[in-house]
Amino acid sequence: NQDLPVIKCVLINHKNNDSSVGKSSSYPMVSESPEDLGCALRPQSAGTVYEAATVEVDVSASITLQVLVDTPGNISCLWVFKHSSLNCQPHFDVQNRGVVSMVILKMTETQAGEYLLFIQSEATNYTILFTVSIRNTLLFTLRRPYFRKMENQDALVCISESVPEPIVEWVLCDSQGESCKEESPAVVKKEEKVLHELFGTDIRCCARNELGRECTRLFTIDLNQTPQTTLPQLFLKVGEPLWIRCKAVHVNHGFGLTWELENKALEEGSYFEMSTYSTNRTMIRILFAFVSSVARNDTGYYTCSSSKHPSQSALVTIVEKGFINATNSSEDYEIDQYEEFCFSVRFKAYPQIRCTWTFSRKSFPCEQKGLDDGYSVSKFCNHKHQPGEYIFHAENGDAQFTKMFTLNIRRKPQVLAEASASQASCSSDGYPLPSWTWKKCSDKSPNCTEDIPEGVWNRKANRKVFGQWVSSSTLNMSEAMKGFLVKCCAYNSLGTSCETILLNSPGPFPFIQDSIS
């Protein structure tokens, strides 16, 4: 039994400093340190085939695929790419390992694919497979998974037509409601495409790739559960597959399940049944209703009936195009500085939306929760009592939706002052928006109580900073006022704040900040 050679596959990324294009096995370039690609024998394959982790390369990047072989004696090799043989010149490194390289300069679409390296040593022959793909995030997609019945088996296949190829996993849970949250101990994940165990309470399939993760839940009617107050509703687009599972548990096997659409039994071939005994010897039956590609006439009330349970229905609605239903009128809120408050959007949508909350050009993660009435809700509480404009944006590939919120925080004004050669300005951001007074400080009025009636120009809510209104007041200076101290005061229902300014001085001169509540 011959020991296999020790094979190491690495990727070397090069910083391009040349514009030539082609393949070579010795090319001077600035290189980053090699990245191991975990070369391993491909399981259950005929012959000795090693496989490297898939390599993703940016367009125009230059790389070297390299194999290091610990095997005695000489080696000969051949690269094959898209049925063409390419020159291969092995050499030996200081550790006396055979080194075979393939340089790909200025990566293009035509250079993506499978690179096969055939190596012949004195002891054995083997093949090394490199898969090189272009990392083009513009071409990346992540599609919601859907279900198909496995041919001649009572099993479901989960399919997600995504790029790069996603990792598909089943997420199974046998509890109810909250305990079936993703991170719950009750949740079991199974990283494979086919699922045979179809009796669980909650069954989801998820697909993940570089763009994130998308999941689809197997729509289920459980005849042993109390029906929801509102009829469950399932939306699908024309051409999508329909899957509904009806589940029932009874003390013995003496019961049957049937599906009807608008009081008509489903056609043969559009349902299948499975049954099993549970640990307490009760019988579990499930009956799937499925349509491989729905049309408008598949809309209606699907009713699951049992000879031993009350029947339950679901409304299946087939739409031509996805939708997002919600009121898009803008909403204004006024809260106290320490009041707990969350923005909330209630919507009905199909397919499921992706959403963001945005404030001050920053995006925040968006969580959505399904409600019993078929609606969903997204809340945003992380406003940290910052006043301004908050935007909820949702999209699902077919529809887009944007809703604006304004948050005002009730607080007394805070004044900022500055002076130039010809005028003095004060601004404040308190809410409700403040009103202004200007006072002159003089020998006659050391407490600055003498009103300045002229030359004042108020701009209420003139400047919007991320939706936050700012009020300002400007005093145009007369020659007679130069060298005097003046005081600007902003006041609203929560208090007053003042700043004192020395006129005819460049730059801001808030000597004293008065706070009069």
């Epitope: 990245e35 993703e56 494979e192």
Partner: antibody
Amino acid sequence: QVTLKESGPVLVKPTETLTLTCTVSGFSLRNARMAVSWIRQPPGKTLEWLAHIFSNDEKSYSTSLKSRLTISKDTSKSQVVLTMTNMDPVDTATYYCARIVGYGSGWYGYFDYWGQGTLVTVSS
Amino acid sequence: DIQMTQSPSSVSASVGDRVTITCRASQDIRYDLAWYQQKPGKAPKRLIYAASSLQSGVPSRFSGSGSGTEFTLTISSLQPEDFATYYCLQHNFYPLTFGGGTKVEIK
């Protein structure tokens, strides 16, 4: 040369939070087909998988310890960090990080490289 | 969670002996099983992956077989450096679970 190196405190008091860092070299955490796991081994006992993280930030946790664990990564520093809250003497173990590799034909490259491990003792 | 039952928990053998270790999964895990060798004070080292594929650089006296729920690690002719503890790992289901270990000792 692929290496993974664990670092963190050797002694933790009960109820405290443990933070361990795994610094990797020789492969990239940016590679969509690479992931890093944390595994622990109490003295004289078997191995226990704790958590892993994929390049797209997808995370999975041990069901029994899920509420106490958080895994994260800093790709630019080639580091994966595990935090474990509310430490107890039964959490005394050698903590390892290990690599996972995915191939075109499946994710069968579980734990082909390991760190040397770091022994964490929980004691007051 | 999937239980991985490894047997025997320990085995005494001599150099040159054939040693067989078994791992049983509480449900079907297909080929998603790996075998590791661990020596005292060291990190585990992978020997076999995908139930029967030999890790590069591992001597061919180690072999793995099985699928579904029954798996076997065989050392065809025990060498002095093979005295260690061996663990199986299933990675078909979350959470990933290891067997209890088999200690191979010198007779």
